[in-house]
């Protein structure tokens, strides 16, 4: 094929492939018609003036993994048509101005994981039909006004995984065709008002894993096409009361991790497209009437991991679509009998790890198709009577760990347990607190002196899909989950969507945090 | 381009286990759920669970509980289907899906892995 | 489990013609705001490919002549003008509860 490197792969469709750590230089000679070369994991160290020189015809370069670190400005001359180069995982700590000279048709530029300390704005100024620009994973630790402000086409900007300590209100401002940016893992503290104001097409932003303790109440006003906006894994202590006000489009927004104390009623603005709202790890201490009634299509929200003592009758105002409800792992002692009334489509109910003492007998009365309650781990004592007869879908009921008092006034509780017995589940059944002479023996079969009916176990419907809430108070620091740290579930066959297996047999949830590019 | 693609077919032995991997690409993998469907020969389509890469997360089908594990490696953008204790009955076409919210439709598939337990 | 019956199990329809299809099941999968239903099309050799999702939204690129309809219990996929790439095997889903399929119905031209 118009002369094949011995060191590489040539193919009939004009791609060239070079890889072996016995290349350290640019083979030679290069198939003239060729219009894809890739040069990987090689030993090549440097690229010098011109190795492309006779394939002018090349579309897509990728040099990635290699041991470059160095690059003479005029390394990639007589590319002009070339639409795409990578020279990802490398080790360049500088970029040489005018390296992507005459370079007319580049519209993808991956550059990340390098070692890459700073870029200019004479890196890209030549690069007015770029679409996409990969800089995540680099040492840069802050963006020159007028870096990118020859990148109008720009649709995709990566700067996540960098050491970027704070941005400048106008760095993005001539980005109007930007549609994604990620800013995540970096070390950004705060947000300037204005930032994102010129970023009127944007849909994807991500924040997370930032220190970002505040937010400016009209920072995101002008982004009406966002779609996800990541803000997870922050210091974020108070939301202003319009900030999420004008993102009619947002389908994905998460707001874990963070240390939010408090959500004023309306703060989630009109989302018609939110379906899932995650704020577990944070330290709400209550929830107002009407916090989430702008959220009709939500389906999904979890609360867990907070310090939530008091919910408002209202709370739940508006969520007539909630599928999944988590409140473990808070600090409730009561619940208002209504408190769950709007939720007429709830499956799925996570209470557990809690300090409820009683439940109100109505507590579940409009929440007919509820199939998994968790409220093992809290101070309960006794149940109302019949506060499960109406829940004809109920297959995953969890008890265990409650100090339950076993005295006459257990007989009803106990013979509805008797019955409804593999609802219960086979891991852990619930024991008898109180009196002493009982304690640790099964509630369901205990002796309390009375007659028990003979009873018929009836068939239970078949498991349903149970939800997952994040328990853990520690995360992995790999990025990869495999079935050592898989989920437990507190419902049988519903793995908690947030668990890792620790050190107790507690559902816990692990996050791992991983953005690809 | 939306992208999910699914490792060889696999020929195994009854008993033994098999895993299945599903690279995903053009899009960001955490972002998604990733739902895994059975198609026997000349049968439809079951539903084997689903894994949400962002936090591992898993959801079975009780009936395939202690069958299937699902897993991930968020570096490598790959999610993973084991199945243990293989039998006849579990020969099948194995696909993964992309799903944007649990309750979603699966947007896009992967071309499907074929398993054949066979002694 | 919510089971899913389609009908017909096969369908032949000449081309330009419509052709209908029906998922039942025994319980509601709707709420006030959306049916938990879609629809898949699978060809021989490929994996099945989204048609409508929630009832009745019509999945990014697919042709108008699909249409979904349908609340509560009985759902109908309708294809108004059979084209011959729309020869293929048509599964309902729902994610109300675990998923489930239908079994699939064979549409064929006449």
């Known amino acids: 094929y118009h002369g094949c490197p011995s060191e590489c792969t040539c193919s009939r469709a004009s791609q060239v492939e070079c890889t072996g750590a016995r290349i350290v230089a640019v083979p030679t000679p290069l198939p003239w018609n060729a219009m894809s070369l890739q040069i990987l994991n090689t030993h090549i160290t440097e690229l010098n003036e011109s190795p492309f020189l006779n394939i002018s015809a090349l579309i897509a370069l990728r040099i990635e993994k290699n041991e470059l670190s160095r690059i003479t400005p005029g390394a990639f001359r007589n590319l002009g048509s070339l639409r795409y180069l990578s020279l990802a995982n490398n080790k360049l700590q500088v970029l040489p101005i005018g390296l992507f000279q005459g370079l007319d048709s580049l519209e993808s530029l991956l550059l990340s994981s390098n070692q890459l300390l700073q870029i200019q704005p004479a890196h890209f100024s030549q690069c007015s039909n770029l679409k996409e620009l990969q800089l995540h994973g680099n040492h840069l630790e802050y963006i020159p006004d007028g870096a990118f402000d020859h990148l109008v086409g720009l649709t995709k900007l990566n700067l996540g995984k960098n050491s970027l300590t704070h941005i400048s209100p106008r760095v993005f401002q001539h980005l109007g065709n930007l549609q994604v940016l990620r800013l995540y893992e970096n070390r950004l503290t705060d947000i300037p008002m204005g930032t994102f104001d010129g970023l009127v097409n944007l849909q994807e932003l991500a924040l997370q894993q930032n220190q970002i303790g505040l937010l400016s109440p009209g920072l995101f006003h002008n982004n009406h096409n966002l779609q996800r906006l990541y803000l997870s894994n922050n210091h974020i202590s108070q939301l202003p009361p319009s900030v999420f006000m004008q993102l009619p489009q947002l389908n994905r927004l998460t707001l874990f991790g963070n240390s939010l104390k408090e959500l004023s009623p309306g703060i989630f603005g009109p989302m018609p497209n939110l379906r899932e709202l995650w704020l577990y790890d944070n330290h709400i201490s209550s929830l107002p009437d009407n916090v989430f009634s702008n959220l009709r299509q939500l389906q999904v929200l979890i609360l867990s991991r907070n310090q939530i003592s008091f919910i408002s009758p209202g709370a739940f105002n508006g969520l007539t679509e909630l599928r999944e409800l988590s409140l473990h792992t808070n600090a409730l002692q009561d619940l208002d009998g209504n408190v769950f009334r709007m939720l007429a489509n709830l499956q799925n109910i996570s209470l557990q790890n809690n300090r409820l003492r009683q439940l109100p007998g109505n507590i579940f009365a409009n929440v007919n198709g509820l199939m998994a309650i968790q409220l093992q781990n809290n101070q309960l004592e006794n149940l109302p009577l019949g506060i499960f007869d109406h829940l004809g879908k109920l297959c995953e009921l969890r008890l265990y760990d409650n100090p339950w008092r076993c005295d006459s006034d257990i007989l009803p509780l106990r013979n509805w347990l008797l019955l409804n017995q593999p609802r219960l589940g086979t891991d852990t059944v619930p024991v008898c607190f109180s009196p002493a002479n009982v304690r640790g023996q099964s509630l369901i079969i205990i002796n309390v002196n009375v007659a028990v009916p003979s009873v018929h176990v009836p068939e239970v419907p078949s498991y349903p899909e149970t939800p997952w809430y994040p328990d853990t108070p520690s995360y992995p620091d790999t990025t990869s989950v495999s079935s050592t740290t898989e989920l437990t579930s507190p419902v049988e066959d519903y793995t908690d969507l947030t668990t890792i297996q620790v050190t107790d047999d507690r559902s816990v949830w692990g996050m791992t945090q991983a953005q690809s590019g | 381009e939306v992208q999910l693609v699914q490792s060889g077919a696999e020929v195994k032995k009854p008993g033994s286990s098999v895993k299945v991997s599903c690279k995903a690409s053009g899009f960001t993998f955490t972002d998604y759920y990733i739902h895994w469907v059975k198609q026997a020969p000349g049968q439809g389509l079951e539903w084997i669970g689903l894994v949400y890469p962002y936090i591992g997360g898993t959801n079975y089908n009780q009936k395939f509980k202690g069958k299937a594990t699902l897993t991930v490696d968020t570096s490598t953008t790959t999610a993973y289907m084991e199945m243990s204790s293989l039998r006849s009955e579990d020969t099948a076409v194995y696909y993964c899906?992309?799903?944007?919210?649990?309750?979603?439709?699966?947007?896009?598939w992967g071309q499907g892995t074929t398993v054949t337990v066979s002694s | 489990d919510i089971v899913l019956t389609q009908s017909p199990d096969s369908l032949a329809v000449s081309l330009g013609e419509r052709a209908t299809i029906n998922c039942r099941h025994h319980q509601s999968v709707s709420t006030s705001s959306y049916s938990y239903m879609h629809w898949y099309q699978q060809k021989p050799g490929q994996p099945p490919k989204l048609l409508i999702k929630?009832?009745?939204s019509l999945e990014s690129g697919v042709p108008d002549r699909f249409s979904g309809s349908g609340s509560g219990t009985d759902f109908t996929l309708t294809i108004s003008s059979l084209q011959a790439e729309d020869v293929a095997v048509y599964y309902c889903e729902q994610s109300w509860e675990i998923r489930t399929f239908g079994g699939g119905t064979k549409v064929e031209i006449k």
């Open positions: 899906a992309r799903g944007d919210n649990k309750y979603d439709a699966m947007d896009y």
């Open positions: 929630y009832a009745s």
